[in-house]
Interface confidence: medium
């Protein structure tokens, strides 16, 4: 009789990465798909994703940017990592066997493990890894932009396929590391001046600097994270117009 047993922390802090393991006994993990499913208190079931014993994965699009699954056939285990936790991630998490590629039902389930996301315990945490997919090509333009202080400048980033809003913008000054400006296409990173704004979804995105300041002369990169692996645009250098 196949049995599944979830293990992991019961209490985690907001923003932490949840790491759960499912141990399969009474049968081999090989040649099956394995899934994670969750159920918030008093709510319905939500499919998180699945993994085959080869390591290939498919994730629920609504969670894709936060989920990573892996499998260890030598231990008869598979695991889930869910990052950037919020209170909305509080749920019972089930692991289940996904019968086969065509029918897609779940014939064996673990007992479930209650995960509570609360500032009452746990560590701090971060992001997950997206699912599989072909490499997305990005065209950033222009490659060079000459402007004066006070100008409004616009940088474009075009994708070879739809990436929803999974796009970030970075600023890099000579000899320095890149700095995050915008994430999720339009969300301003904490501490970044409001003259920076991002827009777009699908395949076309724009970074706008509304009133260029002297410290804004730098190189700007877009980066997609809808599809594995993450890829960057070629960069746009914003230089002072003489």
């Amino acid at each position: 009789q196949v049995q599944l047993q979830e293990s992991g922390p019961g209490l985690v802090k907001p923003s932490e990465t949840l790491s759960l393991t499912c141990t399969v006994s009474g049968g081999s993990i090989s040649n099956y798909y394995w899934s994670w499913i969750r159920q918030p208190a008093g709510k319905g079931l939500e499919w998180i994703g699945r993994i085959y014993t080869s390591g290939s994965t498919n994730y629920n699009p609504s969670l894709k940017s936060r989920v990573t699954m892996s499998v260890d056939t030598s231990k008869n285990q598979f695991s889930l990592k869910l990052s950037s936790l919020t209170a909305a991630d509080t749920a019972i998490y089930y692991c289940a066997r996904y019968y086969d590629i065509l029918t897609g039902f779940f014939d064996y389930w673990g007992q479930g493990t209650l995960v509570t996301v609360s500032s009452g315990g746990g560590g701090s945490g971060g992001g997950g890894s997206g699912g599989g997919g072909s490499v997305i090509w990005m065209t950033q333009s222009p490659s060079l932009l000459s402007a004066s202080t006070g100008d409004s400048v616009t940088i474009s980033c075009r994708m070879s396929q739809d990436i929803s809003s999974y796009l970030a913008w970075y600023q890099q000054k000579p000899g320095k590391a890149p700095e995050l400006l915008i994430y999720a296409a339009s969300s301003l990173q904490s501490g970044v001046p409001s003259r920076f704004s991002g827009s777009g979804s699908g395949t076309d995105f724009t970074l706008t600097i509304s009133s260029l300041q002297s410290e804004d002369f730098a190189t700007y990169y877009c980066q997609q994270y809808d599809s594995f692996p993450p890829t960057f645009g070629q960069g746009t250098k914003v230089e002072f117009k003489r």
């Epitope: 932490e16 790491s19 940017s65 560590g123």
Partner: antibody, heavy 118, light 113 residues
């Protein structure tokens, strides 16, 4: 305050290996994915791979499989990247960077320059 | 993504009577000559248990008073006759291979009078 301290510049011969380090402070090292990014002189950014220090789970861009090996030492909150079989095209600045929610990279190390020359 | 709408949200049935739960999909879940709709029973504090797979196939060990029917977008779970032990929440679930997205209905709570 989140900070990363990367190891110093490396000069290596073709065919050799180097191991770069990135010491993290100011947050729970085991709870965030650490990424590595390559930047050749005058060029753009290339994602190499990522590691979850909590359990050592590492993922690589296809291009860097066999070239880069990512590890992490929880006790010292340090991430490592070993680059093997070095060639001139491996001359670059390598950054460690923390992945936050939405897979965006919020904090970066100062970069380590690797020069491959005979 | 395919959306599954279950009705009713709750249902009170007398012992020995028939209980009928409906699940409607926003688009067809039929392909490969099968209906990719499955039904689960969930009791408090327990994980869901597979009852019916591929719309009408009874999972091994499940009593024959449970049956499933339907195709394309409209599916039904029937319990006849209802027993006291059947008080639970019932979920439908579909598998649509493209875009690799699997969804559950909102659940139907069955109470026994």
């Amino acid at each position: 305050q989140v900070q990363f301290q990367q190891s110093g510049a490396e000069l290596a011969r073709p065919g050799a290996s180097v191991k770069l380090s990135c010491k993290a402070s100011g947050y729970t090292f085991t709870s965030y994915w650490m990424q590595w990014v390559k930047q050749r002189p005058g060029q753009g950014l290339e994602w190499i791979g990522t590691i979850y220090p909590g359990d050592g789970d590492a993922r690589y861009s296809q291009k860097f499989k066999g070239k880069a090996t990512l590890t992490a030492d929880k006790s010292s909150s340090t991430a490592y990247m070993q680059l093997s079989s070095l060639a001139s095209e491996d001359s670059a600045v390598y950054y460690c960077t923390r992945r936050r929610g939405y897979d965006a990279m919020d904090y970066w190390g100062q970069g380590t320059s690797v020069t491959v020359s005979s | 993504n395919i959306v599954l709408t279950q009705s009713p949200a709750s249902l009170a049935v007398s012992l020995g009577q028939r209980a009928t739960i409906s699940c409607r999909a926003s688009e067809s879940v039929d392909s490969y000559g099968s209906s990719f709709m499955h039904w689960y029973q969930e009791k408090p504090g327990q994980p869901p248990k597979l009852l019916i797979f591929l719309a009408s196939n009874l999972e091994s060990g499940v009593p024959a008073r449970f049956s499933g029917s339907g195709s394309r977008t409209d599916f039904t779970l029937t319990i006849d006759p209802v027993e006291a032990d059947d008080a639970a929440t019932y979920y439908c679930q579909q598998n649509n291979e493209d875009p690799n997205m699997y969804t559950f209905g909102g659940g139907t709570k069955l109470e026994i009078r």
